[in-house]
């Protein structure tokens, strides 16, 4: 599919001008290559009318220009003094006319309306309000006032001062007669429809002395604004419908076949399932304007979008609307990243977040999307070392693997962690990628004791059991702080006995803290990684207490949730050993499901090409 995009249809009137904008991916090659505008012939082929290399056809001499805007990835063709001969099929494109890097544009130039003398022209947008003013003389002040619409050869009564209203205008028209000082009556039509366009006649009096005034009403369908965004990127639709609809329900819909417009989101709480978690409707301003952001753009998001206002929260005839034509460029610079990450209660997830690699020094942010609160996203962690208090010890943002991707690790998962999260940076390129965390059935793969108490001056050894599925992974222990997790030395103690059906490839890796000090208190993580790609983690809180008086040494493991055994050795060495085999309730049996991608694999695997890219979780 060609990545060039422009307006599908351009309509104008003889004598007027048009400005046609064509979009292209702003790669270095594209920015400098030839841009052209050509007319398609009946037998194929496309005859150049104007190009960025200075060529201008004789047909366009003195009335057209082509301007390239390489920094925006656009070029603009302006054509003036249009005639009906300019109607036809054109292409705007890059490179050679026949190469296919182009977009088809239909230009329709119509004859201007043949208006009667003394005709007042009213040009109003669809869904808006028009006021048709009708002057009259004093002798007709007390006589019937009326407005007719010319249908074919015959005038049809629309409204009159005796109270008649044509059924087509019920509920949206009124006739106002000004105060005695002004010889004027007005007809106000609201929620204008395309079918309202045409010639009107207003009249005061019914005899030969009546006053008449011709009016031509043109109802404009909004020209869609062209929007060109990258696959996996985001788009913002700013919708400003005016203060007169400030208190009316707003909506954004996507046109499907025909005139249908399927609601994407509205202020009444509706959200299309395909956009769940990647769409934000921001709070309305006092003037009724609002914005909608869609992130994680997919191929199928391309199309025509309308925003409007109607009490039903969906498009109805006469809704004031704004329109956009969204093109999703599949030659995206935004790397793939999973849109769904799965984890188990008590387990962890490692989320990969893309950013513009040119902005490696930008601050990285991770926030929790609050869809219900009009799309606020409270910050959870940033790359400068800020972590929301409730997440201390279980959340870390790592700059690795770098080069356009950072990693967020969240452990000690609970069902409350399920939801949608946003990856952001403060760079100029506003990439907002959405990831959904799903909590699924299963047990964490890594086995650690619960909270552990160490004794000042003694040595503490904390075990972490890794199942055989992680045999090829690097295993580590680190101490969590708000800027990351600092690696610590650890010892491989050989195969673990914590897994019932796991072979010699399982591993017990211990963290040893020698001569414990107060500074050792805190959160410790054990985890797996492959290079700079992180997998599962498990967290243990180590508390530090004073040595008990001789003879009353407490040798039970203080508050160790998994109830592991603790031996106090003669050397003052304190070891925590999990009795997983003796008590099989302590650890769930490892259920290796063939089709399950484990978290560490998922965080580095190439993801599905489908719309809902998923990153696997722990065993289910």
């Amino acid at each position: 599919k060609s990545p060039i995009f422009g307006p599908e249809e351009v309509n104008s009137v003889e004598g007027n001008s048009v400005s046609i904008t064509c979009y292209y991916p702003p790669t270095s090659v594209n920015r400098h290559t030839r841009k052209y505008w050509c007319r398609q012939g009946a037998r194929g082929g496309c005859i150049t009318l104007i190009s960025s290399e200075g060529y201008v056809s004789s047909k366009y001499a003195g009335r057209a220009n082509l301007t390239n805007f390489p920094e925006n990835g656009t070029f603009v063709v302006n054509i003036a003094q249009l005639s009906q001969d300019d109607s036809g099929r054109y292409k705007c494109g890059l490179g050679i006319n026949s190469r296919g890097l182009s977009f088809d544009v239909s230009l329709e130039v119509s004859q201007g309306p043949g208006l009667l003398n003394d005709t007042k022209v009213y040009t109003v947008d669809l869904g808006r309000t028009v006021t048709i003013n009708c002057p009259f003389k004093t002798e007709n002040a007390q006589k019937r006032k009326s407005l007719y619409k010319q249908i074919g050869l015959y005038p049809v009564l629309v409204i009159d001062s005796s109270g008649y209203v044509n059924p087509n205008y019920t509920g949206r028209i009124r006739l106002d007669i000004q105060g005695t000082g002004q010889l004027l009556f007005s007809v106000v039509i609201n929620q204008l429809r395309l079918s309202d366009a045409g010639q009107y006649l207003c009249q005061a009096g019914d005899d030969s002395n009546s006053n008449k005034k011709n009016a031509d009403l043109q109802v404009l369908k909004p020209e869609p604004e062209l929007v060109y965004e990258d696959l996996r990127g985001s788009v913002t639709f700013h919708c400003a419908l005016g203060p007169e609809v400030a208190n009316v329900a707003k909506f954004l819909c996507r046109q499907s076949s025909g005139e249908n417009c399927d609601v994407v989101v509205n202020t009444l709480g509706k959200r299309a399932p395909a956009f769940e978690g990647r769409i934000l409707l921001n709070p309305q301003d006092k003037d009724g304007s609002f914005s909608v952001v869609i992130t994680g753009l997919r191929k199928e998001d391309a199309g025509r979008y309308l925003c409007g206002a109607h009490s039903d929260g969906q498009l109805q005839e006469g809704s004031p609307i704004q329109a956009w034509q969204l093109f999703v460029n599949e030659e995206s610079t935004i790397p793939r990243s999973p849109t769904v990450v799965k984890g188990v209660a008590g387990g962890s997830v490692a989320v990969l977040c893309p950013y513009n690699r040119k902005e490696s020094k930008s601050i990285k942010y991770w926030c929790l999307w609050e869809g219900a609160q009009n799309g606020r996203c409270p910050l959870l962690v940033d790359s400068e070392g800020w972590v929301k208090a409730q997440y201390e010890g279980r959340l870390s943002l790592l700059e690795e693997p770098g080069n356009g991707t950072f990693t967020v690790i969240l452990n000690q998962l609970t069902s409350r962690d399920a939801g949608f999260y946003w990856c952001l940076t403060n760079g100029d390129t506003l990439w907002r990628t959405t990831v959904e965390i799903k909590i699924i059935e299963g047990e964490p793969n890594l086995k650690v004791p619960g909270n552990v108490t160490a004794v000042l001056g003694e040595t503490l050894k904390v075990p972490c059991h890794f199942p055989c599925k992680f045999s090829s992974y690097e295993k580590y222990w680190c101490k969590w702080n708000n800027t990351g997790c600092q690696a610590l030395p650890s010892q491989d103690e050989g195969p673990s006995k914590a897994f019932v059906n796991c072979d010699e490839n399982s591993r017990l890796v211990s963290l040893t803290l020698n001569l414990v000090t107060r500074a050792d208190e805190g959160w410790y993580w054990c985890g797996v990684k492959q290079g700079h790609f992180y997998g599962e983690t498990a967290a243990v809180y180590v508390a530090v207490e004073e040595r008990k008086a001789a003879g009353s040494r407490d040798v039970s493991l203080a508050k160790a949730d998994a109830a592991p055994d603790e031996k106090v050795l003669d050397s003052g060495f304190r070891e925590i050993e999990n009795k997983a085999i003796q008590d099989p309730r302590l650890f769930a049996e490892e259920k290796a499901v063939a089709d399950t991608r484990d978290q560490a694999d998922g965080s580095r695997a190439s993801v599905d090409s489908g719309s809902s890219e998923e990153q696997g979780g722990s065993s289910r």
């Epitope: 409707l281 601050i363 942010y365 606020r376 070392g385």
Partner: nanobody, 131 residues
Framework: EVQLVESGGGLAQPGGSLRLSCAAS????????MYWVRQAPGKGLEWVSA????????YYADSVKGRFTISRDNAKNTLYLQMNSLKPEDTARYYC????????????????????????WGQGTQVTVSS
């Protein structure tokens, strides 16, 4: 005890400059996002600018963008607001505050979520812009 003390306000001509300071004590200053808000006579609070813990993330209200610059010195536990090209509508009492829960809006910008003036605010410093 948490304390925030603003200073540097005063009278300035339209087009002139002022530099506000906010000295923080009683908490780990470098661990908090900070922001400035202002209150014009008879008006509500208006958020002005915010800054991340390390100073790399700076955000501004549209009304001051391009004219004001927020910065911080974590070694000195001080927040600053450099105000250039001052306008009469900048006349207000300026307060600094710490942000317990930084939030972003639909467009990826900092979103001021409001704050209780009794919650660790200083006395403010008055800025008057008049010829």
């Amino acid at each position: 005890e948490v304390q925030l003390v603003e200073s540097g306000g005063g009278l300035a001509q339209p087009g002139g400059s002022l530099r506000l300071s906010c000295a923080a004590s009683g908490f780990a200053f470098s661990s908090y996002w900070m922001y400035w808000v202002r209150q014009a006579p008879g008006k509500g609070l208006e958020w002005v600018s915010a800054i991340s813990t390390g100073g790399g993330g700076t955000y501004y209200a549209d009304s001051v963008k391009g004219r004001f610059t927020i910065s911080r010195d974590n070694a000195k536990n001080t927040l600053y607001l450099q105000m250039n090209s001052l306008k009469p509508e900048d006349t207000a009492r300026y307060y600094c505050a710490r942000d317990e829960a930084p939030t972003f809006d639909y467009s990826g910008n900092y979103a001021y979520t409001g704050s209780d003036p009794n919650d660790y605010w200083g006395q403010g410093t008055q800025v008057t812009v008049s010829s």
